[in-house]
């Protein structure tokens, strides 16, 4: 026996008229049934209507063995066709059918919107045998219904390779409006129009939208969902949200911040990573982008040496990486460096300026008055020179590099010697006789090796020749001298 034990909560007038076979209520119905072991009673809507012939999808039974009488066609009894309930309530519904006892192994499956419901669903099938027929009741329960439970449920029974299908039971879960589209945070240009969109659905429908800006309603009359709010422009940041109303109540969207694009904040923490004689590698931490992506940055370099002009060099670079190698700088010079970055609105102020220095460079001039002569008795070549007049930018002199190339009968060999800064002469051993020795000298500082002097050549005769005439650096513009001794 199936009974509907209790009714409570008022029905919601959602439909213009009664639907045949529909139950529009928040009823909680208790069902008294023989329960399978461990099964707890669930809320359900009981099929109290008497069964009536169903001609849609029926199984026509065969003649009995006696051949005397036909069995009636098999069909599911009609049940409630439409269940309307609120979110988070429990629901139970069922299908019932009487099957002649001649049929064995009947199974009932539940389907939702054309897909079989398998696995962890609360479906229970109970059998009530009688002399000629067995009443089968298949119950389906859902605890704490959600919108995703909305749909059309049917029972299917397979019998004699035929399929018997019940009438659909439509489950309509009603609740507060549910947002399918909420406004999004945006960064907008000052005093420029922009749109926000809000969309919410029931059931129940309709859903009406109110817009809220900084806690105040924007529209006095609600708009049907979906709603697009056109904001003519803002001068300062604002927070927008939308309220969605239906007969169940209201839902408020997330509040979204609409930011006004501005020039970026200045970069911070400009720091020096590496300095050479003519370049400085810097990095910086970008400031706040002003709600608009950085486009590029400008590295500003200002001469700050006491007698400098103060010339300003500006180097444009990409916004990332936040690093730049400043080139074309003077050696041993002081610079003030700042960084500014821009977005679509404009340039940031310049970062705090930092002081940076280049290191000493290589000498820019070669040693002067290079002379070379042969000291035959010692089998040496004697080299003399004058210290170049180097500026401090070239760094402190640490020594000299002497290149001597020996050429004889198609053979050429270059050797390098290093001598200390206090020297202004050097002796090198004769490497090859009957050969030409070409000597060049460069000054060396910590900053590097300077230019070599013009080559000075001296001929080294075979043993026995004695002549000590020197070779010396040519006058500017002259060809390289070759002194044969």
């Amino acid at each position: 026996a199936i009974t509907e034990a209790r009714e409570e909560a008022k029905p919601y007038p959602l439909f213009p008229g009664p639907l045949p076979g529909s139950l529009q209520t928040d009823h909680t119905s208790l069902l008294s049934l023989p329960h399978t072991s461990g099964y707890q009673p669930a809320l359900m809507f009981s099929p109290t209507q008497p069964g009536r012939p169903y001609t849609g999808n029926v199984a026509i039974p065969r003649v009995t063995s006696a051949g005397s009488k036909l069995l009636p066609p098999l069909a599911f009894k009609h049940t409630v066709g439409h269940i309307i309930l609120s979110e988070h309530k429990d629901v139970k519904f069922n299908c019932s059918i009487s099957v002649p006892n001649i049929y064995q192994d009947t199974t009932i499956s539940w389907w939702k919107d054309g897909k079989e419901l398998l696995g962890a669903h609360h479906a229970i099938t109970q059998f009530y045998p009688d002399d000629e027929v067995t009443a089968i009741i298949a119950s389906f329960s859902i605890t704490s219904v959600q919108r995703s439970d909305n749909g059309s449920y049917i029972c299917k029974m397979k019998i004699n390779n035929e399929e018997i299908v019940s009438d659909p039971i439509y489950i309509e879960v009603q609740g507060l409006p549910h947002f399918t589209k909420q406004p999004e945070s945006m960064n907008v240009t000052r005093n420029t129009a922009f749109n926000l969109t809000c969309q919410a659905v029931g059931p129940p429908e309709p859903v009406n939208i109110f817009w809220v800006q900084n806690s105040s309603r924007v529209n006095e009359q609600p708009e049907k969902s979906p709603s697009v709010l056109t904001v003519p422009g803002l001068t300062e940041m604002a927070v927008f949200s939308c309220e969605a109303h239906n007969d169940k109540g209201l839902t408020v969207s997330k509040g979204v911040q609409i930011n006004i694009k501005a020039i970026p904040s200045p970069p911070t923490e400009v720091s020096i990573h590496n300095s050479t004689a003519h370049s400085i590698l810097i990095s910086w931490v970008p400031g706040f982008d002003g709600y608009s992506p950085f486009r590029n940055c400008s590295v500003q370099v200002k001469e700050v040496d006491p007698l400098s002009n103060g010339s300003v060099m500006i180097f444009n670079t990409s916004a990332s990486p936040h690093m730049y190698q400043i080139k074309q700088l003077q050696a041993l010079a002081n610079y003030s460096i700042g960084v500014s970055c821009m977005n679509e609105i404009g340039w940031s102020a310049v970062s705090p300026w930092i002081l940076a220095s280049t290191t000493e460079g290589a000498p820019s001039v070669a040693p002067l008055n290079v002379t070379v002569f042969l000291n035959e008795s010692r089998d040496n070549v004697d080299i003399r020179w004058m210290k170049p007049l180097t500026k401090r930018q070239a760094g402190e002199l640490v020594g000299y590099r002497i290149s001597h190339v020996w050429q004889s009968a198609g053979i050429s060999k270059e050797l390098l010697e290093e001598v200390g800064q206090n020297n202004s002469r050097a002796q090198i051993s004769v490497q090859v006789h009957n050969a030409t020795c070409t000597v060049r000298i460069a000054a060396v500082t910590k900053g590097g090796v300077g230019p070599f002097s013009d080559p000075v050549k001296i001929f080294i005769p075979a043993h026995g020749w004695v002549d000590h005439a020197p070779s010396s650096t040519p006058a500017p513009g002259n060809a390289d001298p070759v002194l044969i001794i």
Epitope: K302, S308, N309, V312, K391
Partner: antibody, heavy 114, light 107 residues
Framework: QVQLQQPGAELVKPGASVKVSCKAS????????IHWVKQRPGQGLEWIGR????????NYNQKFKGKATLTVDKSSSTAYMHLTSLTSEDSAVYYC???????WGQGTLVTVSA | ETTVTQSPASLSMAMGEKATIRCITS??????MNWYQQKPGKPPKLLIS???TLRPGVPSRFSSSGYGTDFVLTVENMLSEDVADYYC?????????FGSGTKLEIK
């Protein structure tokens, strides 16, 4: 051509202040240092300080800190030196000079007298 | 602060003679020394800039030498138009400091 224009003279009372101007033309104002130099009558030259119009950054001679304040107005390409709490010791010709002192203004004679 | 000692305070030369003015700095300033000429009622005029570089338009009878702490301005073949006050200015470090000046006169 490069020019630095200064007013010829300013007469001020003791304890008052004066703002000496130096209007630049003929070059990119924001690209070079502007220096200020003091010369008392019949005396030598004293460096007061310098300012870079690009970022308005000044460097002062310690001796003139608190006495002179250097500023620039980029829109009019003008540098200013504000002298405060004037005494007879401040009576002098004040020159502005550009970059590495290759160009000079004609000088402003500031006379402090009751 | 780098101090600059300029000598002599005054110098009287005959026309055509060579005049020599010296500046000594208290710290090494490399080659960062400027030399100026100032005539009465006029601003100083830059003659020679750092690195002993003669400025454009300055007669070649003016020259300078020196490096580190010792610097010399030389005026060859003194002319009457060279009568003026001469100042050196060190640019090795801030604050910039001028020499006390040399008054060059004609005998």
């Amino acid at each position: 051509q490069v020019q630095l224009q200064q007013p010829g003279a300013e007469l001020v009372k003791p304890g008052a202040s004066v703002k000496v101007s130096c209007k630049a033309s003929g070059y990119t104002f924001t690209n070079y240092w502007i220096h200020w130099v003091k010369q008392r009558p019949g005396q030598g030259l004293e460096w007061i300080g310098r300012i870079h119009p690009f970022d308005s950054e000044p460097n002062y001679n310690q001796k003139f800190k608190g006495k002179a304040t250097l500023t620039v107005d980029k829109s009019s390409s003008t540098a200013y030196m504000h002298l405060t709490s004037l005494t007879s010791e401040d009576s002098a010709v004040y020159y502005c000079a550009l970059a590495s002192f290759a160009y000079w203004g004609q000088g402003t004679l500031v006379t402090v007298s009751a | 602060e780098t101090t600059v000692t300029q000598s002599p305070a005054s110098l009287s030369m005959a026309m055509g003679e060579k005049a020599t003015i010296r500046c000594i700095t208290s710290t090494d300033i490399d080659d960062k020394m400027n030399w100026y000429q100032q005539k009465p009622g006029k601003p100083p005029k830059l003659l020679i800039s750092a690195g002993n570089t003669l400025r454009p338009g300055v007669p070649s009878r003016f020259s300078s030498s020196g490096y580190g702490t010792d610097f010399v301005l030389t005026v060859e073949n003194m002319l009457s138009e060279d009568v003026a006050d001469y100042y050196c200015l060190q640019g090795g470090a801030l604050p910039l400091t001028f020499g006390s000046g040399t008054k060059l006169e004609i005998k």
